[in-house]
Amino acid sequence: KKVVLGKKGDTVELTCTASQKKSIQFHWKNSNQIKILGNQGSFLTKGPSKLNDRADSRRSLWDQGNFPLIIKNLKIEDSDTYICEVEDQKEEVQLLVFGLTANSDTHLLQGQSLTLTLESPPGSSPSVQCRSPRGKNIQGGKTLSVSQLELQDSGTWTCTVLQNQKKVEFKIDIVVLAFQKASSIVYKKEGEQVEFSFPLAFTVEKLTGSGELWWQAERASSSKSWITFDLKNKEVSVKRVTQDPKLQMGKKLPLHLTLPQALPQYAGSGNLTLALEAKTGKLHQEVNLVVMRATQLQKNLTCEVWGPTSPKLMLSLKLENKEAKVSKREKAVWVLNPEAGMWQCLLSDSGQVLLESNIKVLPTWSTPVQP
């Protein structure tokens, strides 16, 4: 008995071939011997089966001795043994129809779980293997679960159902709703304007929701809400903003915040949350601000950084075009009695300069100049 696998909602063509290459009488029946369709001369006739409006054949092939049964918009319950009667012969084809669906919306928040459910006919024992867009393979039976979805899981999932050494492939498009970056860090000299950007990693026709930025300054004992906003069809409107600092927010996507001045008291970490309409849970992006200050007080030249820096980072003070005078894994370094010239304070990671501030040290009879 030939086995054919079909996909729910698809069209399948079951073949039946006579030895004579001409149009002769044929019938297709199901396992209950109920006629589905056949021919009377050159006319297609249909029986009383449930497939009536979904069954068809290809008249153009009859003259070549081919009498296919075409079933459109397949349903799981179409799984059956179909019998083609032609020239006193019976050809049996077992059709097994499978369906694979995501248990919920295919637009899921980062960190949520995806469950794929296989619909299969009674008596079948299929195995399923799915490959995610990032090449991760998961296997299972009737259900497959992927917990903690990541941004890289967005895209087309390819699932192969295996039964009786035959396979059928499903493709499911999954959209993981997330910010492009889970975390970002902004390095600024004191007094510079700070731009925070929160680009989304997906595009949808209409985007509605609300958001808030909570900020934990390094110098503060508790976090505070810096801004709350609404999002209506990709238009941003500010609801409430703190007075210190006075943040400004862009009116269009991507979400964009401007802090007029980087100051040591603002250095720290923020968490932007975005709740989307009709979705449970929130999108999160962490943002960090590191602020550098170089100062000269009497005979002491000091460089300091505030904010969440890695212990790998090196802070250095050097006279322009010279080797570092002091270079330490600290958040503050200083030089006593610095010689006159342009001094550079550098925050670097493995030699890569992340932040630089210059300060001009004048001969001892003058006052320092901050460029």
């Epitope: 212990p311 330490k328 894994r329 600290e330 503050a332 030699g351």
Partner: antibody, heavy 116, light 113 residues
Framework: QVQLVQSGAEVKKPGASVKVSCKAS????????ISWVRQAPGQGLEWMGW????????GYAQKFQGRVTMTRDTSTSTVYMELSSLRSEDTAVYYC?????????WGQGTMVTVSS | DIVMTQSPDSLAVSLGERATINCKSS????????????LAWYQQKPGQPPKLLIY???SRQSGVPDRFSGSGSGTDFTLTISSLQAEDVAVYYC?????????FGQGTKVEIK
């Protein structure tokens, strides 16, 4: 796993220069600094300086200032250390090492002999 | 510059016994900003490059047997080999990576008694 592969042994005359290469394979070349450390026969380890393959920034130990130059070729994931005005006391094994703070991956070493 | 001084210069220990190497820095290598000790220990066998054993003064590098441990803070540090094995015969170096120039101790040679 990242590997650092160095160029072969060199014999040089006093006053000459030597250029040792260190090629990274099997990983990200530019995310860590590369430090150079030398070891004279039967002696301890001495740090010469570092280079960021990403930015090209360098930092040299005062002792080698003016004699050492570190460069890189990002297309081949290779860092170079050139030491000029060689003297007999520069005879040593020269190592490159991945500087992740501590030196977690080392090259196999390049023996440089300075002899007239 | 920070000077690193190791003691003893050489050490002979019986197989299975404990070996202890000390390292003293001329200035503290404990970062007040990050509360971390920027001290590493290396093992070097003849004809081979050094191998990182310990970083942050007490964190064991992956793949290093747990008989190796590091301790100490500020200026005084110790590398302990709890039960010396034949393959542990080598020269051991401490190194500070708190400030440049990065500096090493003079080395301690460990042998079997």
């Amino acid at each position: 796993q990242v590997q650092l592969v160095q160029s072969g042994a060199e014999v040089k005359k006093p006053g000459a220069s030597v250029k040792v290469s260190c090629k990274a394979s099997g990983g990200t070349f530019s995310s860590y600094a590369i430090s150079w450390v030398r070891q004279a026969p039967g002696q301890g380890l001495e740090w010469m300086g570092w280079m960021s393959p990403n930015s090209g920034n360098t930092g040299y130990a005062q002792k080698f200032q003016g004699r050492v130059t570190m460069t890189r070729d990002t297309s081949t994931s290779t860092v170079y250390m050139e030491l000029s005005s060689l003297r007999s006391e520069d005879t040593a094994v020269y190592y490159c090492a991945r500087d992740s703070g501590a030196f977690d991956i080392w090259g196999q070493g390049t023996m440089v002999t300075v002899s007239s | 510059d920070i000077v690193m001084t190791q003691s003893p210069d050489s050490l002979a220990v019986s197989l299975g016994e404990r070996a202890t190497i000390n390292c003293k820095s001329s200035q503290s290598v404990l970062s007040s900003s990050y509360n971390k000790n920027y001290l590493a220990w290396y093992q070097q066998k003849p004809g081979q490059p050094p191998k990182l054993l310990i970083y942050w003064a007490s964190s064991r590098q992956s793949g290093v047997p747990d008989r190796f441990s590091g301790s100490g803070s500020g200026t005084d540090f110790t590398l302990t080999i709890s039960s010396l094995q034949a393959e542990d015969v080598a020269v051991y170096y401490c190194q500070q990576y708190y400030s440049t120039p990065l500096t090493f101790g003079q080395g301690t040679k460990v042998e079997i008694k």
